[in-house]
């Protein structure tokens, strides 16, 4: 489907043409469920809600609604030379018995991620094949997508910038020197971290970062870095804080672990990376947020999910978590406690919670 | 219509630098790149860089990124550019242009001369 | 940086004739050509974008064609007011212009 959005002379700042396909995790009463469903063909853009971006202040953003109050948003933003979807975000209603039968919750979910979607500036992303988007208990898929953003004249530009999916692989050529954009999974790394009272922290984990950055010649990539079982680990163990720092001669990751005493919940608040990209046009790297709510469990128990997890920490720096399982706060006799699992891993067996 | 006014000719000794400006006018300023230009007798055309005044994004030719540094000011819908360590190779008139989206350079300044003498 | 190579630096023609010009990029540049000219004293004026597009209020003398990386120009009927230097521009990937070529009439 096509959808457009307009400012105030009439002319299409945004164009979009594509088909999307969603699959969603949800809990159920007896356990947990996944629901696959197409973005239908009377979905249409929330007039009031998308923009052009105010002028000096803000982005583009197309906001598309469908069924009862579900929303995906595709946020833009550009440099000099490029634009891309920042960030894509999907609001969904487990309320809507229709798409999530026997929902166990009836709350309004809102998940997002940063996107591969890039294009040179005047021309037309162009995505044949599909592009996915993960978040959280959420993939997105678009297909046969062509989007613009920052348009000229309320149509497509004649060029285009093909997805990394789309192009040929060159079958011969030298070695790319360049970490790949996709490397192999991360191998899992075991941390412990110990106070004056014991051990804080127990986690089993194979991490893996996902960074967007401007390469000195001015083009914009995404690369993952993985985290090795041979970086040095420490941390530190508070009443309501715990820190797992992970750290090499290049970069140093800290993952921040809070704890919300009504509920007796802890979880992934805060991460910050400062990392050297030697490549990048400022090779500087330093992001931080500290308003995250991910990996959570009960205190006393262990979160455990087995399904990559992307916890989405700025427009420029995804964490990507593989075969994770991790305790804070705290730990008896330096063992896992009883498991929560996440609700993709999809084994009813267990106790779930929701993130 | 689309204006762009340059700040007046500039005569500098050489190792000095220079910091011209281009006022724009009659468009959104932070919706188009501004775009420099060098065009000196033994050179031609030469393409500086450019500056996306909506976030201070500025690509460079190699060959200007340590002679040149731009900025804009959103305020005053005003870019500028510094020249540093000047030398009498920089005396040229320097352009600020504005392209029409895909139309490549369509809006051109007046220049502005700089000439380096001792 | 893409490279682009003009061709030639000048050349001398008679009035009412036709000259060719051309540029050749160091990589597939997907026709975002343009062509300049520029006088004495005077801005450079777009006379020619996307390798054959004319500028409003062009003559039809002008003329591009091009893709790839092989691209020319022509100006078929030359006029007195042709005298100039003529400058190829890509912006496929951030801009670069040829290095010019001047026109003189015989």
């Known amino acids: 489907a096509m959808f457009m959005v307009k400012n105030g002379n009439g002319t299409a700042c945004i164009m979009a043409n594509f088909s999307a396909a969603f699959s969603v995790n949800y809990d159920t009463k007896s356990g947990p469920k996944n629901m696959t469903f197409d973005l239908p063909s009377d979905a249409t853009v929330v007039l009031n809600r998308s923009s052009c971006g105010k002028e000096n202040t803000s982005d583009p953003s197309l906001v598309i609604a469908f069924g009862r109050g579900h929303t995906l948003t595709l946020n833009f933003t550009r440099n000099a030379t490029r634009y891309s979807v920042q960030l894509m975000s999907f609001v969904y209603n487990l309320s809507d018995t229709h798409l999530f039968p026997n929902a166990s919750s009836k709350e309004i979910k809102t998940v997002e991620s940063i996107t591969d979607i890039r294009a040179d500036i005047d021309k037309k992303y162009r995505c044949v094949s599909g592009t996915q988007v993960h978040m959280n208990n959420v993939t997105v898929t678009l297909h046969d997508a062509t989007i613009q953003a920052y348009l000229s004249n309320s149509s497509f530009s004649r060029g285009e910038t093909r997805c990394e999916q789309d192009r040929p692989s060159p079958t011969t050529g030298p070695p790319s020197p360049s970490p790949p954009l996709v490397p192999t999974n991360p191998t899992v790394s075991k941390y412990n971290v110990t106070g004056n009272n014991g051990t804080c922290l127990l986690a089993s984990m194979a991490l893996q970062l996902n960074i967007t950055y401007l390469k000195k010649d001015n083009k914009t990539v995404t690369r993952a870095f993985n985290i090795s079982p041979n970086d040095t680990s420490s941390g530190s163990c508070g009443i309501n804080l715990v820190t797992l720092k992970v750290e090499n001669k290049n970069r140093a990751l800290e993952l921040q672990f809070g704890m919300n005493a009504s509920s007796s919940l802890f979880f992934l608040q805060g991460v910050r990376l400062n990392m050297t990209l030697p490549d990048a046009l400022v090779p500087t790297f330093s992001i931080s947020n500290h308003s995250l709510k991910a990996l959570q469990a009960t205190v006393g128990n262990s979160y455990k999910c087995n399904t990559e997890e992307h916890i989405f920490v700025s427009k420029m720096l995804s964490l990507n978590v593989f075969s994770v399982q991790v305790q804070a706060f705290k730990v008896d006799s330096d063992r896992f406690g009883s498991v929560e699992e996440c609700v993709q891993d999809g084994n009813s067996m267990h106790h779930h919670h929701h993130h | 219509q689309v204006q762009l006014q340059q700040s007046g000719a500039e005569l500098v000794k050489p190792g000095a630098s220079v910091k011209m400006s281009c006022k724009a006018s009659?468009?959104?300023?932070?919706?188009?790149?501004i775009h420099w230009v060098k065009k000196s007798p033994g050179q031609g055309l030469e393409w500086i860089g450019a500056i996306y005044p909506g976030n201070g994004d500025a690509p460079y030719s190699q060959k200007f990124k340590d002679k040149a540094t731009l900025t804009a000011d959103k305020s005053s819908s005003t870019t500028y550019m510094q020249l540093s360590r000047l030398t009498s190779e920089d005396s040229a008139v320097y352009y600020c242009?504005?392209?029409?989206?895909?139309?490549?350079?369509?809006?051109w300044g007046q220049g502005t001369l700089v000439s380096v003498s001792a | 940086d893409i490279q682009m190579t003009q061709s030639p630096p000048s050349l001398s023609a008679s009035l009412g004739g036709k000259v060719t010009i051309t540029c050749k990029a160091s990589q597939d540049i997907d026709r975002y050509m343009a062509w300049y000219q520029d006088k004495p004293g005077k801005g450079p004026r777009l006379l020619i974008h996307?390798?054959?597009t004319l500028q409003p209020g062009i003559p039809s003398r002008f003329s591009g064609s091009g893709s790839g990386r092989d691209y020319s120009f022509s100006i078929s009927n030359l006029e007195p007011e042709d005298i100039a230097t003529y400058y190829c521009l890509q912006y496929d990937n951030l801009w670069t212009f040829g290095g010019g070529t001047k026109l003189e009439i015989k």
């Open positions: 996307d390798t054959s």
């Open positions: 242009v504005r392209a029409n989206w895909d139309v490549a350079f369509a809006y």
């Open positions: 009659g468009y959104i300023f932070t919706n188009y790149n």
